[in-house]
């Protein structure tokens, strides 16, 4: 569960979990900064414009990110 | 299984601190943030703090903030909830509560500890 | 601040039905999901409800929530009402000035 109300890292938890890119608002992955020295993967859900952290760790995870930006790759002209 | 254990407490008096620990098991307690939630004597369940999987981000009820402080140890599985200042309105059963990495909510508890604040 | 407002009790007979509001106020109820916990007497609050309507594995689907916009509010419906559902149900939400905010919880007794 994110919280946006900070300027440290946003993430409360974290998970292996991929989500279903239908369900994607958009995936935003924030480097590691002065704020937060680790990278965080944040999940905007269509449904209630709900967050999620993603463990960029997980082998799950990365493939969601694979698939995300081939999915995205062929999109672009 | 995924189980949560409060100990530490017990009869404190005013004015004086405390510390409850709550050790965690049986599920990726490194990936996830860890609530407390207490009960006073017949009312109902108020939030009190969390931290995050990491420690960085710790939030707080106004009730407790500047007295309460939550930290934890992930090496040791465990998180704790050091009280200072404690007034009577502290006495209550006190839980620890998984997060919800999917969202907003408290997936699993623990047992509770009650504390006590009298003189 | 956002509030969570639920009655103090209510009391239905073995096999009835009978529905939890819970009403927010300072806010949209709609725009965080509401989660449903149950505590029996003296035990630790298990998950019945989260995400509005969705069901943790191993809870009946006798239990059901719902959101209504209109009124601002939330219920947790349990239907075929059993001796063993008799205790207090709390609403749960998340505000960003309040964090994580309950319900006070409502004692549900079968007759």
């Known amino acids: 569960v994110p919280l946006s109300r900070t300027v440290r890292c946003t993430c409360i938890s974290i998970s292996n979990q991929p989500v279903n890119p239908r369900s994607l608002e958009k995936l935003e992955i924030i480097p590691a900064s002065q704020f937060c020295p680790r990278v965080e993967i944040i999940a905007t859900m269509k449904k209630k414009g709900e967050k999620r952290c993603l463990n960029p760790e997980s082998k799950a995870i990365k493939n969601l990110l694979k698939a995300v930006s081939k999915e995205r790759s062929k999109r672009s002209p | 299984q995924v189980q949560l254990v409060e100990s530490g407490g017990g009869v404190v008096q005013p004015g004086r601190s405390h510390t409850l620990s709550c050790a965690a098991s049986?599920?990726?307690?490194?990936?996830?943030?860890i609530h407390w939630v207490r009960q006073a004597p017949g009312k109902g369940l108020e939030w009190v703090a969390v931290?995050?999987?990491?420690?960085?981000?710790?939030f707080y009820a106004d009730s407790v903030k500047g007295r309460f402080t939550i930290s934890r140890d992930n090496s040791q599985n465990t998180v704790y909830l050091q009280m200072t200042d404690l007034r009577p309105d502290d006495t209550a059963v006190y839980y620890c509560?998984?997060?919800?990495?999917?969202?907003?909510?408290?997936?699993?508890w623990g047992k509770g500890t009650l504390v006590t604040v009298s003189s | 601040n956002f509030m969570l407002t639920q009655p103090h009790s209510v009391s239905e007979s073995p096999g009835k039905t009978v529905t939890i509001s819970c009403t927010g106020s300072?806010?949209?109820?709609?725009?965080?999901?509401v989660q449903w916990y149950q505590q029996r007497p003296g035990s630790a609050p298990i998950t019945v409800i989260y995400?509005?309507?969705?069901?943790p594995s191993g809870v009946p689907d006798r239990f059901s929530g719902s959101i209504d916009s209109s009124s601002n509010s939330a219920s947790l419906t349990i239907s075929g009402l059993r001796t063993d559902d008799e205790a207090d149900y709390y609403c749960?939400?998340?505000?960003?000035?309040?964090?994580?905010?309950f319900g006070g919880g409502t004692k549900v007794t079968v007759l």
């Open positions: 300072g806010g949209s109820i709609d725009r965080n999901y």
């Open positions: 931290i995050s999987y990491d420690g960085s981000n710790k």
């Open positions: 049986g599920f990726a307690f490194k990936n996830s943030g």
């Open positions: 749960q939400s998340y505000d960003s000035i309040n964090l994580w905010v």
């Open positions: 995400e509005d309507n969705q069901r």
């Open positions: 509560a998984r997060d919800g990495s999917e969202s907003e909510y408290l997936d699993y």
